[in-house]
């Protein structure tokens, strides 16, 4: 576990002049930033959007845009952008920084947001290292920033996967946690306020109860976007009382241009129609040249370069910008209790014993509907079924012609003839038997069992060859 930290130093026109904003501001503005982290893109599967996490900065100071030229450097929000990560730090990652402008005019539906710049870079970074500085151009804009990844105790190391242990031989006792990296002792974790939610609360100082995003209340038991009166269970309900419903995050639909709003913990998400983009679907000037299709999506433009775009998304992604991972297993494509695995590039079904097929649709134990061709019969057993084929046929479904002479069954130069009931051997002079296996003595008496009555040596010997082909 740990935190990725991003510090924006400046954002303004790059060398070579002031960029002309594609959006005309009608009043005071302020900036904010969004950071998105993805693991280094693997060769096997496309990663889900911002799989390592994302964060929004606070809003920066209000400024008024001059139509002639923007300020040399636009005023920035205070503080770091922090993206906590729960698992190991991957080392190689994609860093996406978006600069957004919020117009504070008198628009209906609240402020208008527009995306000014977006930089995407793949980076290699070890956790615990110093701040790494960078300067990136996005069109005519220039963004200067620093970033680092740091582990949160007890995790240490370049990937935050090692746990710090005391150097002394004795391990930490009950109720104690491992030491800080350079200390040779154990420390007790802070005791949170009594009743603080184990699920939604945490503390860094004894006696406090800090809430995870989306939860509130003294003990972090109240969801932020509660839309109806909630009586809390437990001893605190009498003191907490009933939460008065505030406006839900989707009230009044903050999504512009026909976007649909869905609530998320403590916030909302807009699903934008074709041709629109942004946190509130407010950006309409985006074309394919802006690269709006994420996760390998292909941008298909309209008849002219300035017309609206659509994104053709790779399998496994959806949304107007291919920004949402499809939970294809939720459609329960695997039949007969099979386990669904979404590999990113394809679906796989792991079938229960006795079932097979891409979607576990074949019941191996079931002869019902199982067609064995050419007179074959279906035989169940051993957790599978098979076809027992009639003479002259083989293969999984008895559809293949089987040549009984292919194995050269007639000994001593006998000639083999296929027959509806099997095969017939025409023996060379001096031999007899169903497969010409017995030599004939000079006096015409066989040394082994005699030929069937009425059959002279050298006559064709008919041998009913019951050679069933069993295929699992």
């Amino acid at each position: 576990a740990g935190v990725f930290e991003l510090q924006i130093h400046s954002f303004g026109p790059g060398p070579g002049g002031a960029p002309r904003s594609p959006y005309s501001a009608r009043g005071p503005c302020r900036l904010f930033f969004r950071v998105c982290l993805k693991p280094g893109l693997s060769e096997e599967a496309a990663e889900s959007p911002c799989a390592l996490g994302a964060a929004l900065s606070a809003r920066g100071p209000v400024y008024t845009e001059q139509p002639e030229a923007p300020a040399p450097d636009l005023p920035l929000p205070n503080g770091l952008l922090q993206v906590p990560f729960r698992d190991a730090w991957p080392g190689t990652f994609s860093l996406i920084i978006e600069t957004w402008r919020e117009e504070l005019g008198d628009q209906i539906g609240g402020p208008a947001w527009s995306l000014l710049a977006r930089v995407t870079r793949r980076r290699r970074l070890a956790a615990g290292g110093p701040w790494a500085g960078d300067i990136q151009r996005a069109g005519a804009w220039e963004l200067r920033f620093s970033y680092r990844a740091r582990c949160e105790l007890p995790a240490v190391g370049t990937a935050c996967t090692r746990l710090c242990r005391p150097r002394s031989a004795s391990r930490c006792g009950p109720g104690l946690r491992p030491c800080a990296p350079l200390e040779d002792e154990c420390e007790a974790p802070p005791v949170c306020r009594a009743g603080c939610s184990l699920e939604h609360g945490f503390c860094e100082q004894p006696g406090e109860c800090r809430c995870l995003e989306g939860w509130t209340g003294p003990l972090c038991m109240v969801p932020v976007s509660t839309s109806s009166c909630l009586g809390l269970r437990g001893p605190s309900s009498t003191t907490t009382g009933c939460l008065v419903p505030g406006p839900g995050p989707c009230d009044g639909n903050p999504c512009a241009n026909g976007g649909s709003c869905s609530e998320t913990p403590g916030s909302f998400e807009c699903t934008c129609p074709r041709g629109f983009y942004g946190l509130r679907c407010e950006v309409s000037g985006v074309t394919c040249a802006d690269g709006p299709c994420f996760n390998g999506g292909l941008c298909v433009g309209g008849a002219d370069p300035d017309s609206a775009y659509i994104c053709h998304c790779p399998p496994g992604f959806q949304g107007s910008n291919c920004e949402k991972r499809v939970d294809r297993c939720s459609l329960q494509p695997c039949r007969n209790g099979g386990l669904c695995l979404d590999l990113g590039h394809a679906l796989r079904c792991r079938c229960r014993a006795g079932f097979a097929g891409p979607r576990c649709e074949h019941d191996l134990n079931d002869c019902a509907g199982r067609a064995c061709a050419n007179g074959g019969t279906c035989v169940e057993g051993g957790g599978a079924h098979r076809c027992s084929c009639a003479l002259g046929f083989g293969g999984r479904d008895c559809r293949e012609r089987a040549d009984p002479c292919a194995a050269r069954p007639c000994a001593h130069g006998g000639r083999c003839y296929a027959h509806f009931s099997g095969l017939v051997c025409a023996c060379a002079p001096g031999y007899m038997g169903a497969r010409c296996e017995f030599p004939v003595h000079p006096d015409g008496v066989s040394a082994l069992p005699a030929a069937p009555p009425g059959l002279r040596p050298g006559d064709p010997q008919r041998y009913p060859h019951h050679h069933h082909h069993h295929h699992h």
Partner: antibody, heavy 118, light 108 residues
């Protein structure tokens, strides 16, 4: 590993319609986009069209008025039809699978040469 | 459409040498959606690089890709005999999908 096999006539008369079929060796036809690309003798590659089992298609604008791409999941096949062919359409035609991480092509058929002549 | 121009047209090198191939786009290739292919005579192309810098499965690490925006590079750090072939770049950020004209790497 999945394999792709193109099939169709190697000789087409001018003004007629070229029809090619690509057979996918496994049952993955519903998991990927599938595409046709061509290469005139001694020249470079030209993308023609792609299709997804959901019905999504996309065509190269330079050929769109003459091209139809279709897909048959039951046969694990997809097909290309190019109408009103001329000598300029003579090429090696490849079918290919679209990569799962973007619209590049990770599996290709061996290609089939199509000659246009009367 | 985005036009991709590859240079040089032909590159004459010896085995063991380093090859640097260039692909320049007429406009920005969004999200570094650029691929490289290798094609031997009489064979279909083979995907080498996608996303400008990610090697496809089974591709040796002597092949590497770099670049963003409009300028992209394929580097073969040490040429092996089987590397002498034609190389194509392809952008897949904006429809229509387009290929470069190719660079032939031949034995000097």
């Amino acid at each position: 590993q999945v394999q792709l096999q193109e099939s169709g006539p190697g000789l087409v008369k001018p003004s007629e319609t070229l029809s090619l079929t690509c057979t996918v060796s496994d049952n993955s036809i519903s998991n990927y986009y599938w595409s046709w690309i061509r290469q005139p003798p001694g020249k470079g590659l030209e993308w023609i069209a792609y299709i997804y089992y959901s019905g999504t298609t996309n065509y190269n604008p330079s050929l769109k008025s003459r091209v139809t791409i279709s897909l048959d999941t039951s046969k694990n096949q997809f097909s290309l039809q190019l109408s009103s062919v001329t000598a300029a359409d003579a090429a090696v035609y490849y079918c290919a699978r679209v990569f799962h991480w973007g619209f590049a092509f990770d599996i290709w058929g061996q290609g089939t040469m199509v000659t246009v002549s009367s | 459409e985005i036009v991709l121009t590859q240079s040089p047209g032909t590159l004459s090198l010896s085995p063991g040498e380093r090859a640097t191939l260039s692909c320049r786009a007429s406009q920005r290739v969004s999200n570094t959606y650029l691929a490289w292919y290798q094609q031997n005579p009489g064979q279909a192309p083979r995907l080498l690089i996608y996303g400008a810098s990610s090697r496809a499965t089974g591709i040796p690490d002597r092949f590497s890709g770099s670049g963003s925006g409009t300028d992209f590079t394929l580097t073969i750090s040490r040429l092996e005999p089987e590397d002498f072939a034609v190389y194509y770049c392809q952008q897949y950020g904006t429809s229509p999908l387009t290929f470069g004209g190719g660079t032939k790497v031949e034995i000097k």
